[in-house]
């Protein structure tokens, strides 16, 4: 399965301090993106 | 089937401890990342902590409000992720749902802070 | 932190007609990739959370078309194209941008 996202990416810092965005990694650690079969609900996004 | 099923919540006094367990199946774990959500009766949820996976050293995120006196933590080798409260307050009062923020969920199990 | 307020608090729909909620943001939630991180959920009375949409428009895995998410930057509206019964319940706008997390206060569908 393709992944929908490249968790290499750091995110998108808006603000000094402020944690990596979840955007560009969670998705991929999600309960749906780790049960590989099926279908998941987040599609490729490129 | 997927399961996380929260257990620990109970009647405590302010300033006391508790420990709460989500205990997940039905998928393979070690590369999830985990949250706690708790929601106060009749109030919107309030996202309180965050644990990611080994391959992230585990790292850990906290609201501001519990920063200090809570700590999540996991156990891969029995699929569960862990809530410790320490100085409880009354407005740690609430439901806590464990959960990967998206699409799963919890039951959640109730914390209530109370002399 | 990042301030979501919904509008209206409750609205009351007739089956079969349509219902839009609204939730403005404190701050931009379009990431430099062209993602705008705003999800929406429903709470079903004595539930959790269930997922309708995320990133603003794309719906979840097994929720009907009738529900659709749309918006811009900071302003951001669900629409239920028919309303049905099992769609009682409190909705929730929520941004996973930034930490922390946050959600907005709700609003409460109930039925006429």
């Known amino acids: 399965l393709a992944d929908p996202l490249d968790h290499r990416d750091a995110g998108d810092l808006w603000f000094p301090g402020e944690s990596e965005s979840f955007e560009d990694a969670h998705v991929e650690h999600s309960i749906s993106r780790s049960l590989l079969e099926g279908e998941i609900p987040f599609p490729p996004t490129s | 089937e997927v399961q996380l099923v929260e257990t620990g919540g109970s009647l405590v006094q302010p300033g006391k401890s508790l420990r709460l367990t989500c205990a997940t199946s039905?998928?393979?774990?070690?590369?999830?990342?985990l949250h706690w959500v708790r929601q106060s009766p009749e109030k919107h949820p309030e996202w309180v902590a965050h644990?990611?996976?080994?391959?992230?050293?585990?790292?850990?995120y906290y609201a501001e409000s519990v920063k200090g006196r809570f700590t999540i933590s996991r156990d891969d080798s029995k699929s569960s992720v862990f809530l410790q409260m320490n100085s409880l307050k009354e407005e740690d009062t609430a439901i806590y749902y464990c959960?990967?923020?998206?699409?799963?969920w919890g039951q959640g199990t109730l914390v209530t802070v109370s002399s | 932190d990042v301030v979501l307020t919904q509008a209206p608090l409750s609205v009351s729909v007739t089956p079969g007609e349509s219902a839009s909620i609204s939730c403005r943001s404190s701050?931009?939630?379009?990431?430099?990739?062209?993602?705008?991180?705003l999800y929406w959920y429903l709470q079903k009375p004595g539930m959790s959370p269930h997922l309708l949409i995320y990133?603003?428009?794309n719906l979840a895995s097994g929720i009907p078309d009738r529900f659709s998410g749309s918006g811009s930057e900071t302003d951001f509206t669900l629409k239920i194209s028919e309303v049905e019964p099992e769609d009682v319940g409190v909705y929730y706008c929520?941004?996973?941008?930034?930490?922390?997390?946050?959600f907005g206060a709700g609003t409460k569908l109930e039925l006429k």
């Open positions: 959960t990967d923020i998206l699409e799963y």
């Open positions: 039905g998928f393979p774990f070690s590369n999830v990342w």
């Open positions: 644990i990611k996976a080994k391959s992230d050293n585990y790292a850990t």
């Open positions: 701050r931009s939630l379009l990431t430099s990739k062209g993602i705008t991180s």
């Open positions: 990133r603003m428009s």
């Open positions: 929520a941004q996973f941008l930034v930490y922390p997390y946050t």
